[in-house]
C-alpha cells in the first residue's frame, strides 16, 4: 500500500487509520495515494510544518481525541483537495492565522470540544466553500464582527457550549445560506434586533440554556423558514405580541424553564405545523381568551408548574385537536364551566397539585373522549352529581389527597366510585378528611350512616348509571391508555430539570440535553 507506517492500518481504498497512545508524532511515511487519514486517541501534542505534504490527494482528515495543543501555521499546506477536516476533542487554545489557507475545497471544519479562547476574521477568510463549521464546546467569549463574513456558503454553524455573553447584530449578516444555527448553553443575556435578519434560509435556531431576558419584537421576522426554535431555560419574562407572528413553518418550539408571567392573545400565531407546546416551569399567572387560538393543530399543551390562578373561559379557543392538557402544579382555585368546552378531542387532563375547591357540574360536558383525569392533591370536598356520567372512555381517574367530606352528600360519589373502582387505580384511593370520626377511612367503603348518624340519608341514585365492566367492549383496554404521569417530552414532571441523563455523549429528551453536533 505504497508504504504504510507500522503504527497505522492502511486499506486498498486509500484509507489510513493511526491510533494508539504510543503515537507521539504524525507517522511517516504516509501512503502518497491516501484519501482519508484518521489520527485518533494518540499522544500527539503538536503538528509541525507540512506533515502531510506528500499526500495531496487527501479528501478527509480526522485528528481527534488527541493531546494536540499546538499547530504550526503551515501544518495543512498542500492539501488543496481536502473537503473534511476535524480537529475535534483536542486541547487547542489558539488557532494560528493562516492555518486553513490553501484549503480551497474545504466543506466541513470541526473544531469542537477544544479550549479555543477566540476566533478572528482572518481564521476563516480563505474558507469560501465551507458549509459546516463546528465550534461548540470551546471557551469563546465573543465573536468579532467579520468572523464569518467570507463563509457565504455556510449552512450549519454550531457555537453552542461556549462562554458567549453577547452577539453583535452584524456577525451573521452575510450567512444567507445558513440553515442551522446553534447558540445553546452560552451566557447570552440579550440578542440585539437585526441579529438574525440576514438568515432568510434558517430552519433551526437553538438558543436554549442562555440567560436571555428579553426578545426584541422583530427578532425572527425575517426567518420565515424557521422550523425549530429552542428558547427553553432562559430568563425570558415576556413575549412581545408580534415576536412569533411570521413563523408559519414552525414545528418545534420550546419555552419551558423561563420567567414568563403572561401570554397575550394570539401570541402564538399562525403555526399550522406546531403539534406540541411546552410552557411548563414559568411564572404564568393567568390565561386570557384566545391565547392559543392560532394553534389549530396543537395536540399537546403543557402549562404545568406555573402560577396560574385564573383561566378565562375562552383561553383554549381554537384547540380543537388538543389531546393532552397539563395544568398540574398551579394555583387554580376555581374553573369556569365552559373552559374546556372547545376541547372535543381531549383525552388526558392533568389538574393535580392545585387548590381546586369545587368543580362545575358541566366542566367536562363536551369532552366526551376523556380517558384520564388527574385531580389528586386539590381541595375538593365533593363533586357534582353526574360530572363523569358521559365519559364512556374514562379509564383513569385520580382523586386521592383531597379533603373529602364524608357526610350524606358524598353518597352519590361514593356509589359511583364503588361501581367504577378499577378506574381509580390501585396505588392510592381517596379517603375521608371529615367528619373527624371517619378521617383516613376509604371513601369507597365508608358507611355514611355511621359517619353522620344524626343525618337521615335519603335514597340517592348512584353517580352515573353506567358502571364500569372490565369486559364491556365499549370500554378501551386499559393497556392502551397512555400513562398520565406527565413526563412529556421534554420531561417536565417530578424531575430535576438540571439532571442530565447521558447516554454515549448524548441524551434523551428527558431533561436538559447534552448532545454535541
Amino acid at each position: 500500500y505504497h508504504g504504510c507506517p507500522s503504527e497505522c492500518t492502511c486499506s486498498r481504498a486509500s484509507q489510513v487509520e493511526c491510533t494508539g497512545a504510543r503515537i507521539v508524532a504524525v507517522p511517516t511515511p504516509l501512503p502518497w495515494n491516501a484519501m482519508s487519514l484518521q489520527i485518533l486517541n494518540t499522544h500527539i501534542t503538536e503538528l509541525n510544518e507540512s506533515p502531510f505534504l506528500n499526500i495531496s490527494a487527501l479528501i478527509a482528515l480526522r485528528i481527534e481525541k488527541n493531546e494536540l495543543s499546538r499547530i504550526t501555521p503551515g501544518a495543512f499546506r498542500n492539501l488543496g483537495s481536502l473537503r473534511y477536516l476535524s480537529l475535534a476533542n483536542n486541547k487547542l487554545q489558539v488557532l494560528p492565522i493562516g492555518l486553513f489557507q490553501g484549503l480551497d475545497s474545504l466543506e466541513s471544519l470541526l473544531l469542537s470540544s477544544n479550549q479555543l479562547l477566540q476566533i478572528q476574521p482572518a481564521h476563516f477568510s480563505q474558507c469560501s466553500n465551507l458549509k459546516e463549521l463546528q465550534l461548540h464546546g470551546n471557551h469563546l467569549e465573543y465573536i468579532p464582527d467579520g468572523a464569518f463574513d467570507h463563509l457565504v456558503g455556510l449552512t450549519k454553524l454550531n457555537l453552542g457550549k461556549n462562554s458567549l455573553t453577547h452577539i453583535s447584530p452584524r456577525v451573521f449578516q452575510h450567512l444567507g445560506n445558513l440553515q442551522v444555527l446553534r447558540l445553546y448553553e452560552n451566557r447570552l443575556t440579550d440578542i440585539p434586533m437585526g441579529t438574525f435578519d440576514g438568515l432568510v434560509n434558517l430552519q433551526e435556531l437553538a438558543l436554549q440554556q442562555n440567560q436571555i431576558g428579553l426578545l426584541s419584537p422583530g427578532l425572527f421576522h425575517n426567518n420565515h423558514n424557521l422550523q425549530r426554535l429552542y428558547l427553553s431555560n432562559n430568563h425570558i419574562s415576556q413575549l412581545p405580541p408580534s415576536v412569533f407572528m411570521q413563523l408559519p413553518q414552525l414545528n418545534r418550539l420550546t419555552l419551558f424553564g423561563n420567567s414568563l408571567k403572561e401570554l397575550s392573545p394570539g401570541i402564538f400565531g399562525p403555526m399550522p405545523n406546531l403539534r406540541e407546546l411546552w410552557l411548563y416551569d414559568n411564572h404564568i399567572s393567568s390565561l386570557p381568551d384566545n391565547v392559543f387560538s392560532n394553534l389549530r393543530q396543537l395536540q399537546v399543551l403543557i402549562l404545568s408548574r406555573n402560577q396560574i390562578s385564573f383561566i378565562s373561559p375562552g383561553a383554549f379557543n381554537g384547540l380543537t385537536e388538543l389531546r393532552e392538557l397539563s395544568l398540574h402544579t398551579n394555583a387554580l382555585q376555581d374553573l369556569d364551566g365552559n373552559v374546556f368546552r372547545m376541547l372535543a378531542n381531549l383525552q388526558n387532563i392533568s389538574l393535580q397539585n392545585n387548590r381546586l375547591r369545587q368543580l362545575p357540574g358541566n366542566i367536562f360536558a363536551n369532552v366526551n373522549g376523556l380517558m384520564a383525569i388527574q385531580l389528586q392533591n386539590n381541595q375538593l370536598e365533593n363533586l357534582p352529581l353526574g360530572i363523569f356520567d358521559h365519559l364512556g372512555k374514562l379509564c383513569e381517574l385520580r382523586l386521592y389527597d383531597n379533603p373529602w367530606r364524608c357526610d350524606s352528600d358524598i353518597l352519590p360519589l361514593r356509589n359511583w366510585l364503588l361501581l367504577n373502582q378499577p378506574r381509580l387505580g390501585t396505588d392510592t384511593v381517596p379517603v375521608c378528611f371529615s367528619p373527624a370520626n371517619v378521617r383516613g377511612q376509604s371513601l369507597i367503603i365508608i358507611n355514611v350512616n355511621v359517619a353522620v348518624p344524626s343525618v337521615h340519608v335519603p335514597e340517592v341514585p348512584s353517580y352515573p348509571e353506567t358502571p364500569w365492566y372490565p369486559d364491556t367492549p365499549s370500554y378501551p383496554d386499559t393497556t392502551s391508555v397512555s400513562s398520565t404521569t406527565e413526563l412529556t417530552s421534554p420531561v417536565e414532571d417530578y424531575t430535576d430539570l438540571t439532571t442530565i441523563q447521558v447516554t454515549d455523549d448524548r441524551s434523551v429528551w428527558g431533561m436538559t440535553q447534552a448532545q454535541s453536533g
Epitope: T155, Y184, Q203, T484, V508, W509, Q513
Partner: antibody
Framework: QVQLVESGGGLVKPGGSLRLSCAAS????????MSWIRQAPRKGLEWVSS????????YYADSVKGRFSISRDNAKNSLYLQMNSLRAEDTAVYYC???????????????WGQGTMVTVSS | DIVMTQSPSSLSASVGDRVTITCRAS??????LAWYQQKPGKAPKILIY???SLESGVPSRFSGSGSGTDFTLTISSLLPEDFVTYYC?????????FGPGTKVEIK
C-alpha cells in the same frame, strides 16, 4: 440491556384486525417518543406512526390514517398498534423503534425491535 | 410530504473500496437526516444522525455530509460486513419518510 420486543403478528384476512405490542426494557420508557416502522417483503422501510412520550401527540402516515391507532402504557413499558380494516398492502414486518430526539440536533430511531410479521391474505 | 430519493439503488464494489451513496430530499430539511444500515433478516441500525454526526459505537469508516436537500453517506474502506442495504431518513417534519434504499453488493 436496552431492548424492544414486538409481538402480535400473524395471518389475518383482508378487512380484519390485529393488535401489535412492543415490550420495552433497559431504559426509562416514559422518557422517549416511540414509533412503528414497517417493511413489506423485499421492499424498503416505511414510517407508520409515532407517539410522544406522554402519549398526547400522535402522528400517522397517510396510508394508515383512520385505520391504525398507536397507543402506549407507560406503567407497563409497552407500545401498541391497533390495526383495523387491514389490506393486502399492509403485509409487512412491523418494527417498533425508540425515537430519540433532543434540542442539540439528535434525531434518530436509535433502538429497534426484531420485528413481527403481519400477513394479510384471504 | 417530503420525498426522499437515493442513488444509486444498488452498486457493486470490492472489499477496501471507497463508496458514496447520495440521498436527496424534495425540499430543504436542514440537517435533520439519519442514515441506517440493514442486514438481511435484521432490523436497521443507526449509523449517522444530524446528517454528519457518527452514532456512538459506529466504526469511523462511515461518514455523512450535506445539508438542505443533498446528502451523502461515505464508507471509506468497505469491509465484508458492509455489503448490505443503506437507508436515509428525514426527521425535519412528519411523516418521517425514508429513502428507497441502496444495496451494496460484492463485485
Amino acid at each position: 440491556q436496552v431492548q424492544l420486543v414486538e409481538s402480535g403478528g400473524g395471518l389475518v384476512k383482508p378487512g380484519g384486525s390485529l393488535r401489535l405490542s412492543c415490550a420495552a426494557s433497559g431504559f426509562t420508557f416514559s422518557d422517549y417518543y416511540m414509533s412503528w416502522i414497517r417493511q413489506a417483503p423485499r421492499k424498503g422501510l416505511e414510517w407508520v406512526s409515532s407517539i410522544s412520550n406522554s402519549g398526547g401527540a400522535i402522528y400517522y402516515a397517510d396510508s394508515v390514517k383512520g385505520r391504525f391507532s398507536i397507543s402506549r402504557d407507560n406503567a407497563k413499558n409497552s407500545l401498541y398498534l391497533q390495526m383495523n380494516s387491514l389490506r393486502a398492502e399492509d403485509t409487512a414486518v412491523y418494527y417498533c423503534a425508540r425515537y430519540n430526539w433532543n434540542d442539540r440536533g439528535y434525531d434518530a430511531f436509535d433502538i429497534w425491535g426484531q420485528g413481527t410479521m403481519v400477513t394479510v391474505s384471504s | 410530504d417530503i420525498v426522499m430519493t437515493q442513488s444509486p439503488s444498488s452498486l457493486s464494489a470490492s472489499v477496501g473500496d471507497r463508496v458514496t451513496i447520495t440521498c436527496r430530499a424534495s425540499q430543504g430539511i436542514s440537517s435533520a437526516l439519519a442514515w441506517y444500515q440493514q442486514k438481511p433478516g435484521k432490523a436497521p441500525k443507526i449509523l449517522i444522525y444530524d446528517a454528519s454526526s457518527l452514532e456512538s459505537g459506529v466504526p469511523s469508516r462511515f461518514s455523512g455530509s450535506g445539508s438542505g436537500t443533498d446528502f451523502t453517506l461515505t464508507i471509506s474502506s468497505l469491509l465484508p460486513e458492509d455489503f448490505v442495504t443503506y437507508y436515509c431518513q428525514q426527521f425535519n417534519s412528519y411523516p418521517h419518510t425514508f429513502g428507497p434504499g441502496t444495496k451494496v453488493e460484492i463485485k
